[in-house]
């Protein structure tokens, strides 16, 4: 004969395990329903009753099968220098990630909760390293024969033109000048502006429009000014 | 852009019924909340109760409890408020509000209002 | 229910002044779920502060919230003549939902 298929709630066997998005209540002792992402358990089970679920209260989320008695509280708006790349929803908590520009200074288990503006190198500085999702950009100085002329989180040292006859000689913020015959370059430039960190999540580079009646969907969080680094700016 | 259009003012007798309206636009009923607040004249701001326009799920203030009735139809965009059993002190501008889900219950867009006024 | 209460009930005060408003909430409420309200006569509310201390777009930076637990505050810095107007607090952090009686800021 084929076994009976129990229905919640039930008595598990001795020694047996209730199953799948099934939980065990201690008080009740039966195997009873867990409740479904989106939803907590608003009344636990009984020997005689299985468990009542009810959908996440506005701004609370439950992401797994489930038998807690309040959902999760979702994370505070983005702030301005955040972009939200997954919203808070009954089933899903808020991340907010850093913007362009910015970068994670302070993580979190899903998201970022402190982003910090990356470093500009200031002209004589180029980019040694560029800045990631996680970490600032390294400036250094530019070696004889290069320059930057920039204030920038992305340029690096470009090589002086060489010329037939110098005007004015490059240093290392600035390049060379020559007179009116056509200049040549020392090296292949190469990518003069290294590309911004790209984020391993689909970000929305632009946040909904804020109604002018209405709250925005963003606010600064005060980010304290970092010690500048050699070759860097507060800009 | 958001817009929240009520129905006109009225004037009801105690004891009547009044159904307010109120039309979105602009933008999708998923994940959002209507909510309906009254002000009576000169006083300050009251929660009446809120509605899932998606569900049509709501909630109110219990002293609403058996004469307030909020209704949705999604094909219109439209959601109801329907207050009965009106008596003078029922006498208020009433305004249907939205929250977006996940922002803490902040109404962020307001209806314009509608007057309703209880008089024998 | 959680009971707002604000205080003052009105203020008169000067373009430039500084002006502060209480809120005190009869228990704990989350400061995510606390937000301010700006009504001028004849107009809808707007939404002026949400999650305790966050502005709005629109809302000029002269504005700022605090607080935490049962006690909040709005601040204006230095009173324009646009700002003359009733703000209330309102709680969702359980329902039923309040409001504060309002705060009428007027010139002196």
């Known amino acids: 004969l084929p076994a009976q298929v129990a229905f919640t709630p039930y008595a598990p066997e001795p020694g047996g395990t209730c199953r799948l998005r099934e939980y065990y209540d201690q008080t009740a002792q039966m195997c009873c329903s867990k409740c479904p992402p989106g939803q907590h358990a608003k009344v636990f089970c009984t020997k005689t009753s299985d468990t009542v679920c009810d959908s996440c209260e506005d701004s609370t989320y439950t992401q797994l099968w489930n038998w807690v008695p309040e959902c999760l509280s979702c994370g505070s708006r983005c702030s301005s220098d955040q972009v939200e790349t997954q919203a808070c929803t009954r089933e899903q908590n808020r991340i907010c990630t850093c913007r362009p520009g910015w970068y994670c200074a302070l993580s979190k288990q899903e998201g970022c909760r402190l982003c910090a503006q990356l470093r500009k190198c200031r002209p004589g500085f180029g980019v040694a390293r560029p800045g990631t999702e996680t970490s600032d950009v390294v400036c250094k100085p530019c070696a004889p024969g290069t320059f930057s002329n920039t204030t920038s989180s992305t340029d690096i040292c470009r090589p002086h033109q060489i010329c037939h006859v110098v005007a004015i000689p490059g240093n290392a913020s600035m390049d060379a000048v020559c007179t009116s015959t056509s200049p040549t370059r020392s090296m292949a430039p190469g990518a003069v502006h290294l590309p911004q960190p790209v984020s391993t999540r689909s970000q929305h580079t632009q946040p909904t429009p804020a109604p002018s009646t209405a709250p925005g969907t963003s606010f600064l969080l005060p980010v304290g000014p970092s010690p500048p680094a050699e070759g860097s700016t507060g800009d | 852009q958001v817009q929240l259009v009520q129905s006109g003012a009225e004037v009801k007798k105690p004891g009547a019924s009044v159904k307010v309206s109120c039309k979105a636009s602009?933008?999708?009923?998923?994940?959002?909340?209507m909510h309906w607040v009254r002000q009576a004249p000169g006083q300050g701001l009251e929660w009446i109760g809120r509605i899932d326009p998606a569900t049509g799920n709501t909630k109110h203030d219990p002293k609403f409890q058996d004469r307030v009735t909020m209704t949705s139809d999604t094909s219109t965009n439209t959601v109801y408020m329907e207050l009965s059993s009106l008596r003078s002190e029922d006498t208020a501008v009433y305004y249907c509000?939205?929250?977006?889900?996940?922002?803490?219950?902040?109404?962020?867009?307001w209806g314009q209002g509608t007057l309703v006024t209880v008089s024998s | 229910d959680i009971q707002m209460t604000q205080s003052p009930s009105s203020l008169s005060a000067s373009v430039g002044d500084r002006v502060t408003i209480t809120c005190t909430a009869s228990s704990s409420v989350s400061s995510n779920y606390l937000h301010w309200y700006q009504q001028k006569p004849g107009s809808s509310p707007k939404l002026w502060i949400y999650?305790?201390?966050n502005l709005p777009s629109g809302v000029p930076s002269r504005f700022s919230g605090s607080g935490s637990g049962t006690d909040f505050t709005l601040t204006i810095s230095s009173l324009q003549p646009e700002d003359f107007a009733t703000y209330y607090c309102h709680q969702y952090h359980r329902s039923p939902w309040t409001f504060g009686q309002g705060t009428k800021v007027e010139i002196k």
């Open positions: 602009g933008f999708n009923n998923k994940d959002i909340y």
């Open positions: 509000a939205r929250s977006p889900y996940g922002d803490f219950g902040a109404m962020d867009y």
């Open positions: 999650s305790t201390s």
